[in-house]
Every structure is written in C-alpha cells, then in structure tokens.
C-alpha cells in the first residue's frame, strides 16, 4: 500500500478493540411476582427469569435479587416492556356519575442504583393514565434508551402496582440491557 | 468468585474481531397488504418493503416472503412498530347500552421460526385493549428487544387484524433487526 | 495464501475496525420549551438538554439549536420518547352530546434534514388519537429504529402540540442516537 495514507480519522482506534461477542448482555423475562416489602412512596421492583426460555445473561452481566449488575463501565442500551392488565378503573365509573376524576395510572420506571450517588436515579419512566370504558383492559408500556453506566451499578424495573403486571407470557413483559 | 472485584478482562479478545459495517442489518417498511390465507387461531404475517425509501437490507440479511432471514448466529436487536387505525370499536357502543363487554384488542407479535424447533417462537408481543369513545381511532404498538438467534432463523411480524394496519406511511409501521 | 479461495466467513474484515467507545453517541433530555415560530402545517421541533443530568453527547456527535448533528456516515439507532399530558380532549365532551367526532391526536415525528435533499425526511412517526374520559390524561409515545445516515445530516423531534409535552422530568421525554 505504498504511499497510501490512512483513511479518515474516525477509523483510528483510541481505545482497546474488543470482540462484540464478549460484551455484557442480558434479556430477562417476567415471572410471577411474590409480594415484597418496599419503601413507602417507592414503587416495588419486579423480579425476573434470567436463564429459562428466552432469558439469558452473558459475559459477566449477572442478575440477582431484582437487579441487573453492571460488570463494566460504558454506554449501555437499556429497555423494558411491562404489560399491565386490570378491571375497569374507578375513573370511568366515577365519570359516569358525573364527577370528573383524576384518572388512575400505570407507571414503569427503570432505576439505577449506584454507589457514587446516595439516591436511586430514575433513568426512564413511562406513565399513562388509565380511564377505560370496557370492563377489562390491558396495555404495554415500552421504554428504551442509552445510558453511561459505571462498573458496579445496579438496574431494576419498578412499577406502580405489581398486581396489575401481566406475568403470563415471557414475550409480554421483559427487561434487558447490552453494552454498546 | 466470592468477594472478587470485576476483572478487567473485557479488554482481552476471546472472539474474532469484526468490522461493525459488515454486520447483518435490515429496516423494513410497511406496504399495502394483500389478503392472504392464514391458519385459524394464527395471526397473519405482514409483508414489507425491503429496498425502497427508508428500507434496506445489508450484509447477507435478506428479506423474502414476509420473513427476515438470519445469516449469522449471534445476538440481535429486533424491533417493530405497527400503527393501527379503525372505526369506533363495538365495545363503547355496547357499553353505552349498559352491557359490559370484553374489549376489542390489537396485537403485534414478532415471531421466530427455526429449523431446530417445530413450533414458531413468540419473541415479543404487544397487546392492547381498544375501547375508544371517538368515532375513529389510531395508535401505535412498539416492540424491541435483544435475542440470541441462529443462522437460518426466520423472523416475521404477525398482527391480530391485518385490515387495521396503517400502511400509508413508511415511518408509521416498520420492522428491523441488527446484529449486535 | 496461494491458491486459497476467500472463505465466506463473517469473521473476515472488509471495513476498518474501530473501538466502540469512539463512536458518536447522544442522549438528550427534555427541557422547558419556549414558544417558537414554526411554519404552518409543520410540527414544531423540541429543544433539548445535552449535558446536564442524564444527558450527554460524545465523540463528535453534537447538539445545536434543536438538531443532533451526525458527524460520520453509517447506520444509527435513533430513539425518542415524548410524554404528553392534557386536560380532557374536546372529543369526549362532543361525544357526550351525541355528535361523533374525529378525535384529537398526539404525534411525534423524528425528522432528518439533509443537504442533499430539499425536503425534510420523516424517519419515524408515532401518532395516537386521544379521546379520554377522565379529566386529566397523560401518556408516552416511544419510537426507535435504525437508519443509514450521512455525515452532516441533522435530526430533530417534532410534535403536534408543544404545549402538551411533559417537560418536568428528564426520564419522561428524551431523544437519542448512536452509531452501530
């Protein structure tokens, strides 16, 4: 390649190369939830399946006690879907009676717990008013985005009401993260 | 690894390095659907545009006959959005008449078909009750997550009612996957 | 390698390797919007926080004047969530009076502006009819997909009604992109 200069500078490598197959990754799927104690004014955390069916963790990304454990600092794409289901919310009944009402709601939060900050950090929130006319309702909330995480950080998914979560199928409610 | 700090091993390479630009990728966009025969109790599959406008397939990721064909084993991020639209669902009319009703619903499923398993596998499902008050309604369902796929696997998007899919714009209804 | 045919293996490198940590990336978070002039029939663009809290831009991905600027050609995953909130839409009130009505709606569009094309390109659209029974409503629209972008392209997020956007929390409304 005599006399050939290297191509544009974004192709230069300023950090160690690494094989993509070696990156921390996890996809967790829903399981039936057992009622757990949680702090007042703090949404309960879901726990997850991490090895059966579609679920997996790999390359030092581990799952334990409701948390995904981040084994390596870097930028991660984090996502979750929670499917909720319930009976008619009180809202529509009150509405029928002619009294406007602050609607019921469903909320999903992906939360980071880090030792470099004393308070859990809400990374992503999906929140939706529920004021259904039909007798039974169901709907998903999906979230996903990229965040800079530190080695040792812990991720969890919190929901406004654990009893409304559809835990029946692994494709309806899930949680995942992968190092970019 | 009790009490062990996370090793800095992620800088070691245990798998072949590969250029990111060489990875299988596809983004497919909606086209007008032609009614097709499908099995009873099985949702019909959408077919897609794979080369015009925003749509593309590259690096041996091919599209054929409603399926994305996986050319290489690995972890893929798979996503789809389907925008549905319809007239007032029966639900609200029945509700008006004072009869509670199981609501109508809209559902999207991303399905994997694999040689090594006789049954299609539902990877992702977004399902929502539809019980609208207005005369015309429209709304998207978005799905996305990471899965370990094998060379030769096929991916498709199934919907509960093909006639409700908004096929008018390539940015409203789409399907994609890329090797991580 | 005399006489050896090139293997079909995906482990061969046809493009320059590059460190993942060197790739253009951004995650932008919502700020309070100031009313801005926008063309009739064109949705207004949101502006964003790019460095405080969870927000960041890195590796030559810059944010300026409502636009993410693409510094390098390639395939990008682009995503956004916008949380909307409002009072009861007119729709249900009109419905109460017995007049069917085209429902109000909320829409998010991720738009690409490119030098080589006179018209902005709509990459992603999430649009939903809003016909709520309760007095206050709120809900997110999430979008995400992969697109081939060119160096110099600009990305923005447009919404149907800027006054309905929930700007109160960085985890509710956000916009991001990263080179794959």
């Amino acid at each position: 390649l005599k006399g050939q200069e290297f191509a544009p500078s974004h192709q230069q490598v300023y950090a160690p190369l690494r094989a993509d197959g070696d990156k921390p990754r996890a996809h967790l799927t829903v399981v039936r939830q057992t009622p757990t104690q949680h702090f007042k004014n703090q949404f309960p955390a879901l726990h997850w399946e991490h090895e059966l069916g579609l679920a997996f963790t790999k390359n030092r990304m581990n799952y334990t006690n409701k948390f995904l454990l981040i084994p390596e600092s870097g930028d991660y794409f984090i996502y979750s879907q929670v499917t909720f289901r319930g009976m008619t919310s009180e809202c529509s009944e009150i509405r029928q009676a002619g009294r406007p009402n602050k609607p019921d709601s469903i909320t999903v939060v992906i939360t980071k717990v880090t030792d470099s900050y004393p308070e859990p950090t809400q990374l992503l929130m999906g929140t939706k008013s529920v004021c259904e006319v039909g007798s039974n309702w169901f709907q998903p909330i999906y979230l996903g985005a990229m965040f800079s995480l530190q080695e040792g950080d812990k991720l969890m998914v919190n929901v406004s009401d654990i009893s409304l979560v559809d835990y029946t199928k692994e494709d309806k409610t899930f949680f995942g993260a992968f190092l970019l | 690894l009790k009490g062990q700090e996370f090793a800095p091993s992620h800088q070691q390479v245990y798998a072949p390095l590969r250029a990111d630009g060489d990875k299988p990728r596809a983004h497919l966009t909606v086209v007008r659907q032609t009614p097709t025969q499908h099995f009873k109790n099985q949702f019909p599959a959408l077919h897609w545009e794979h080369e015009l406008g925003l749509a593309f397939t590259k690096n041996r990721m091919n599209y054929t006959n409603k399926f994305l064909l996986i050319p290489e084993s690995g972890d893929y991020f798979i996503y789809s959005q389907v925008t549905f639209r319809g007239m007032t669902s029966e639900c609200s009319e029945i509700r008006q008449a004072g009869r509670p009703n199981k609501p109508d619903s809209i559902t999207v499923v991303i399905t994997k078909v694999t040689d090594s398993y006789p049954e299609p596998t539902q990877l992702l499902m977004g399902t929502k009750s539809v019980c609208e008050v207005g005369s015309n309604w429209f709304q998207p369902i978005y799905l996305g997550a990471m899965f370990s796929l094998q060379e030769g696997d096929k991916l498709m998007v199934n919907v509960s009612d093909i006639s409700l899919v908004d096929y008018t714009k390539e940015d409203k209804t789409f399907f994609g996957a890329f090797l991580l | 390698l005399k006489g050896q045919e090139f293997a079909p293996s995906h482990q061969q490198v046809y493009a320059p390797l590059r460190a993942d940590g060197d790739k253009p990336r951004a995650h932008l978070t919502v700020v309070r919007q100031t009313p801005t002039q926008h063309f009739k029939n064109q949705f207004p663009a949101l502006h964003w926080e790019h460095e405080l809290g969870l927000a960041f831009t890195k590796n030559r991905m810059n944010y300026t004047n409502k636009f993410l600027l693409i510094p390098e050609s390639g395939d990008y995953f682009i995503y956004s969530q916008v949380t909307f909130r409002g009072m009861t839409s007119e729709c249900s009130e009109i419905r109460q009076a017995g007049r069917p009505n085209k429902p109000d709606s909320i829409t998010v569009v991720i738009t690409k502006v490119t030098d080589s094309y006179p018209e902005p390109t709509q990459l992603l659209m999430g649009t939903k009819s809003v016909c709520e029974v309760g007095s206050n409503w709120f809900q997110p629209i999430y979008l995400g997909a992969m697109f081939s972008l060119q160096e110099g392209d600009k990305l923005m997020v447009n919404v149907s009604d800027i006054s309905l956007v929930d700007y109160t929390k960085e985890d509710k409304t956000f916009f991001g992109a990263f080179l794959l």
Epitope: V113, E119 | F6 | -
Partner: antibody, heavy 116, light 106 residues
C-alpha cells in the same frame, strides 16, 4: 426503622487482624451498597471500601487494598470488615455506612484501639 | 487519587451570620457531598449531588458548584450548627473527604 450497628473487639494487638461486623435492619441491604469509613483520632474521615451485597462486588481504597477485606452474609443481614497486620496507626472509630438509597445512613461507630 | 482541598480549616462566626465553606477537587467530579459531624457522633449527610438537600435538613443549608469548585453555605448560622463540616467525592477510587472545617460561634 433503618439501623446500622457495628460490633467487634475494642482492642486489637499489633500485627493481628481487626474484625468488625455491621448488622443492618429496617431495609433490604441487597438494594444498596455498604461502606466502611474510619476516623483516626484528631483526623478526618477515610473511606476504606465498599461491597454490593447483591453481587459481592467490592471496591477498596488502594492504600489499604492489600490489608482490607469486606464480605457479607445475607442470611444474617451482616457486612464484615477485616483489616490485617494492624499497627497503632489503625486506631480509629470505624463506621459502617449505607449508600445508594436515601437517606444516607451511618452507624454510630465502633472505637478500635490497636495496642499491645 | 482525587484530592479534596477544603477551606478554611476553621472559622468563627456570630449567630445569624452567613457562613461559606469551599471545596476544590484536584480533578473534575460530577457530584459533591457535604456532611456535618458533631463531637462524638457519626457524620450526617446534609447535601448530595452538589446541591440537593437531604431529607429533614433545614433549608438554611445549601450547596452549589460543579467541576472542581464547590461551595457549602449556611445562610444564617444557628447555635446548633456548631460542628465540623466535610466535603466528599464519591466518584474516583478511592472516595475522598476534605480535611474538614470546624465551625464555632463567636
């Protein structure tokens, strides 16, 4: 009520190993991180290290790393500190601290004297 | 290590005075924490994330700053504020504290 209680011998001989236990109550300590901080007489505060009880992942102050070990026992809701080869310079009040979930909580401290 | 340089090391002020303590980090940090320690007691968190007031802490305490320079302020000194105040960064390894500022009443 959230509580952290340090316990252990108040006197340790030089060259021996200092061992302290922190027993927590009122919260799931796997949801947070547990640190050890010490304060030598008339001196400021020195961070020694921390453990994530969920994963047992530890981080240590490099200046103490060769001598310090932090472990946890989830069945007992306890975190333990071991500091080997102690000298008189290790005489201090040792605090167990919770972080990662407000409020930031400190134990009342345990005075350990290193003396022969 | 990230060194934390706190100043002054001690100060004496009257009840009602505005008191300011500064902390400089040897390299940029995202967050700063401020603690109050009374004699014979464990430190108590007052400010986290540079400017957030911890639960139950009176509003006369405040924090500000970013990067390497941070400030802690007591807007109106009260007799119960007699204590030693420490800044701390939670980012680099090791976590490090300032050397402390002893606040006394004139």
């Amino acid at each position: 009520q959230v509580q952290l209680q340090e316990s252990g011998p108040g006197l340790v001989r030089p060259s021996q190993t200092l061992s302290l236990t922190c027993t927590v109550s009122g919260f799931d300590f796997q949801d947070t991180y547990m640190h050890w901080v010490r304060q030598r007489p008339g001196r400021g505060l020195e961070w020694m290290g921390r453990i994530d009880p969920a994963s047992e992942h530890t981080k240590y102050n490099p200046s103490l790393k060769s001598r310090v070990t932090i472990t946890r026992d989830t069945s007992k809701n306890q975190v333990s500190l071991r500091l080997s080869s102690v000298t008189a310079a290790d005489t201090a009040v040792y605090y167990c601290v919770r972080s990662g979930g407000l409020p930031d909580v400190w134990g009342q401290g345990s005075l350990v004297t290193v003396s022969s | 290590d990230i060194q934390m340089t706190q100043s002054p090391s001690s100060l004496s002020a009257s009840v009602g005075d505005r008191v300011t303590i500064t902390c400089r980090a040897s390299s940029s940090v995202s967050y700063m924490y401020w603690y109050q320690q009374k004699p014979g007691k464990a430190p108590k968190l007052l400010i986290y994330g540079a400017s957030n007031l911890a639960s139950g802490v009176p509003s006369r305490f405040s924090g500000s700053g970013s990067g390497t320079d941070f400030t802690f302020t007591i807007s109106s000194l009260q007799p119960e504020d007699i204590a030693t105040y420490y800044c701390q960064q939670w980012e680099g390894n090791p976590r490090t504290f300032g050397q402390g500022t002893k606040v006394e009443i004139k």
